[in-house]
Interface confidence: low
């Protein structure tokens, strides 16, 4: 049998294989060793009894999509079943005072490797033994604490596969310089020891992403923005965007980075070098917003000009992006490309990423101040509470309830959170009263809200003791 | 050489029970995967009744006969067996004892036995 | 269940003719597909597993194929010991379902 018979039905093409050479990753061509790696597939009654206690479950993730020639990242977690962990020494154990289907076990153990791991029944003495080794017969490598790894995991994608020795959570890092563009199945294999081979305990597959375009996510946010994700905003007051690239292993770290905004408003474009960047819409309605992102890539090298036709000088290629220490170059995609020819061969690519959006520009409350606190007098039976009314003013449009939350000095521990309903003139005054309990200094928060805005505006007031001659102070506003 | 051989057929009313045999030899009964039986109607098509694992532990019936045939095995014997209760006209058939491939996952039968004749008629 | 639709019901050819018969699973049963070939008063014998693999002892003029979910048994150069009913099996999920079967005739 071979790895392609064992690993997946998936057979690339022979130019697929030719041109997705991954570093450090080996043919499956190669043959298996189903004497110490018995072979079930899907269906197969004994992955039932793989595992003591029920099924292992395996968790493949990858920080997918990846742009072309930077490392992608998987994953793989086991999750045990019920009650059960990997203790320090790699030992499978039952959790102290966990219940489970068969009850509290008396055996602390599910899986003690220790046991028979450190016989060193059948070793050449480095160690090594005819059953220390990977699938295809590559011995294991001897890292310190060897012995305490017990799962084998076999990753295997685009027609090769890699062999890992590990606890219940490995990581593999794969450089996609030569990895066709487009979507890719990694599957992964895990085996655990027995005896002195190995059995199947878990099989998962997931899909990744390779692409020459730059992962680009925009985030928006808005003072006084009721809901951030509806993508509506207000009219008059900054948004703030914020573009996120996706690039988990720091592959543009040294690149220089451009942003180019088209708003949708006929402000024009707005390029810049920041990731963030503040627009203000001054019209209600819907705008179309465009971002376009370029990154000076490190990319393949072109081939070299032809030499020139004594009739026609050909231009020479554009040398004028800076040097970069590259990955083993690979395919840059099939649009056409910016390219940069470099003396060191350490080539550049400009590559591009996308983002749109439709976002709606409303009226909403745009800003909200107090301009006056009264101290009601109360009648005698409540002389512990002060009665306050707050008059308030707000900008833009009319809200339709008001909320006060009162909290200590600090503003962290709140005490009391009362919202109405508010029936507000054009000219956006109103008084709201409120009822404080015992003197003291109070943090005030207090909202205007309508259907997608929320204003804040806060303060501190020193309420005094109830003496007449005592008056109310606004601390700070 | 591997063989199979199936007893215990036969005529048999409605309502009633009948059990099946199957003597294994020529492997390593126990150490091998699942064992099935699959029956077939007269003039008919193939059809999966039921699958017991290595050990006897996992067991597999098609809907149809869930809760009325029961699939065993006994290792030391090299035997497996179908106990068939409640039998109506309808499985009627040619009974096959069936091993499943022995290296992998795979539920396909790479060794028959000769089959049985089971008719279930008043 | 996963159906599996098996063409055509019978068919006749001649010696050292080539036949494809056809199964077509209702849903992706990634390869899981085996060939089996059974004759009048026999139990069937398995021919090809995963769905291009052939059995040990199972003549080279057997072969099988897919593509998406069809799947393919082909004989080349038809001896007159192939005359017989062939059904195809999904060994992907249970319950374990079989083609209706094709019987094949020599002319």
């Known amino acids: 049998k071979r790895f392609h018979d064992v690993l997946g039905n998936e057979r690339p093409s022979a130019y697929m294989r030719e041109h997705n050479q991954l570093n450090g990753w080996s043919s499956d061509e190669n043959d298996w060793n189903e004497k110490l790696y018995p072979v079930w597939k899907r269906g197969d009654m004994r992955w039932k009894n793989s595992w003591k206690g029920g099924r292992v479950q395996a968790v493949l993730t990858s920080d997918s999509p990846a742009l072309v020639g930077s490392n992608i990242t998987f994953a793989v977690n086991l999750i045990f079943p019920r009650c059960q962990k990997e203790d320090a020494n790699g030992n499978i154990v039952y959790e102290k005072n966990c219940r489970n289907e068969a009850g509290l076990s008396a055996d602390p153990y599910v899986y003690n490797w220790t046991a028979w791991s450190e016989d060193s029944d059948g070793e050449n003495g480095t160690g090594q033994s005819h059953h220390n080794v990977f699938p295809d017969g590559k011995p294991f490598p001897h890292h310190p604490g060897w012995r305490r790894w017990n799962f084998i995991y076999v990753f295997h994608t685009l027609g090769q596969y890699f062999q890992k020795l590990g606890r219940c959570s490995v990581r593999v890092s794969v450089n996609t310089a030569n990895v066709t563009l487009g979507p890719q199945l990694m599957e992964v294999t895990v085996y655990r020891r027995h005896g002195r081979a190995y059995v199947p305990i878990a099989q998962v597959k997931d899909v990744y992403v390779v692409t020459d375009q730059i992962p680009v996510f925009v985030t928006m946010f808005q003072k006084n923005d009721r809901n951030s994700s509806d993508e509506t905003f207000l009219k008059d007051l900054p948004i703030m965007f914020d573009v996120l690239i996706h690039d988990p292993s720091h592959f543009l770290n040294y690149s220089t980075i451009n942003y180019k905004w088209s708003f949708g408003d006929n402000t024009g474009l707005f390029v810049s070098t920041n990731h963030t960047v503040n627009h203000t819409y001054v019209l209600n309605g819907t705008f179309s917003l465009n971002l376009t992102v370029k990154a000076a890539a490190p990319g393949p090298c072109p081939p070299p000009p032809p030499p020139p036709r004594p009739s026609k000088p050909t231009p020479s290629l554009a040398t004028t992006l800076k040097s970069y220490d590259s990955n083993t170059p690979g395919p840059a995609g099939d649009n056409p490309l910016e390219l940069s020819r470099i003396p060191d061969e350490n080539c550049q690519i400009n590559r591009y990423g996308h983002f749109q959006a439709t976002i709606t520009i409303v009226e909403g409350i745009l800003e909200v101040n107090i301009i006056q606190m009264t101290d009601v007098l109360m009648p005698v039976p409540w002389p512990e509470s002060s009665l306050i009314d707050f008059v308030v003013t707000c900008q833009g449009s009319i809200p339709t309830e008001v909320c006060t939350i009162i909290s200590d000095p600090t503003c962290e521990i709140t005490q009391n959170t009362v919202c109405s309903p508010v029936d507000v003139d054009e000219m956006c005054l109103l008084t709201v009263r409120r009822t404080f309990n015992g003197s003291g200094t109070y943090c005030v928060n207090l909202t205007l809200g309508d259907d997608t805005s929320l204003a804040l505006t806060s303060t501190l007031i020193s309420v005094p003791d109830r003496d007449p001659a005592s008056p109310l102070r606004m601390a700070n506003s | 050489e591997v063989q199979l051989v199936e007893s215990g057929g036969g005529l048999v009313q409605p309502g009633r029970s009948l059990k099946l045999s199957c003597a294994a030899s020529g492997f390593t009964f126990s150490s091998k995967s699942g064992m099935a039986w699959v029956r077939q109607a007269p003039t008919k098509g193939l059809e999966w009744v039921a699958s017991i694992s290595n050990g006897g532990g996992d067991t597999y019936y098609r809907d149809s006969v869930k809760g009325r045939f029961t699939i065993s095995r006994d290792n030391a014997k090299n035997t497996q067996y179908l106990q068939m209760d409640s039998l109506r006209p309808e499985d009627t058939a040619t009974y096959y004892c069936?091993?499943?491939?022995?290296?992998?996952?795979?539920?396909?039968?790479?060794?028959w036995g000769q089959g049985v004749m089971v008719t279930v008629s008043s | 269940d996963i159906q599996m639709t098996q063409s055509p019901a019978s068919l006749s050819a001649s010696l050292g003719e080539t036949v494809t018969i056809e199964c077509l699973a209702s849903?992706?049963?990634?390869?899981?597909l085996a060939w089996y070939q059974q004759k009048p008063g026999k139990s069937p014998q398995l021919l090809i597993y995963d769905a291009s693999s052939l059995q040990d002892g199972v003549p080279s003029r057997f072969s099988g194929s897919e593509s998406g979910t069809q799947y393919s048994l082909e004989i080349n150069s038809l001896q007159s010991e192939d005359a017989a009913t062939y059904f195809c099996?999904?060994?992907?999920?249970?319950?374990?379902?079989f083609g209706a079967g094709t019987k094949l005739e020599l002319k």
């Open positions: 099996q999904q060994h992907h999920d249970y319950p374990y379902t």
């Open positions: 069936a091993r499943h491939r022995d290296y992998g996952y795979d539920a396909y039968f790479d060794y």
């Open positions: 849903e992706d049963i990634y390869s899981s």
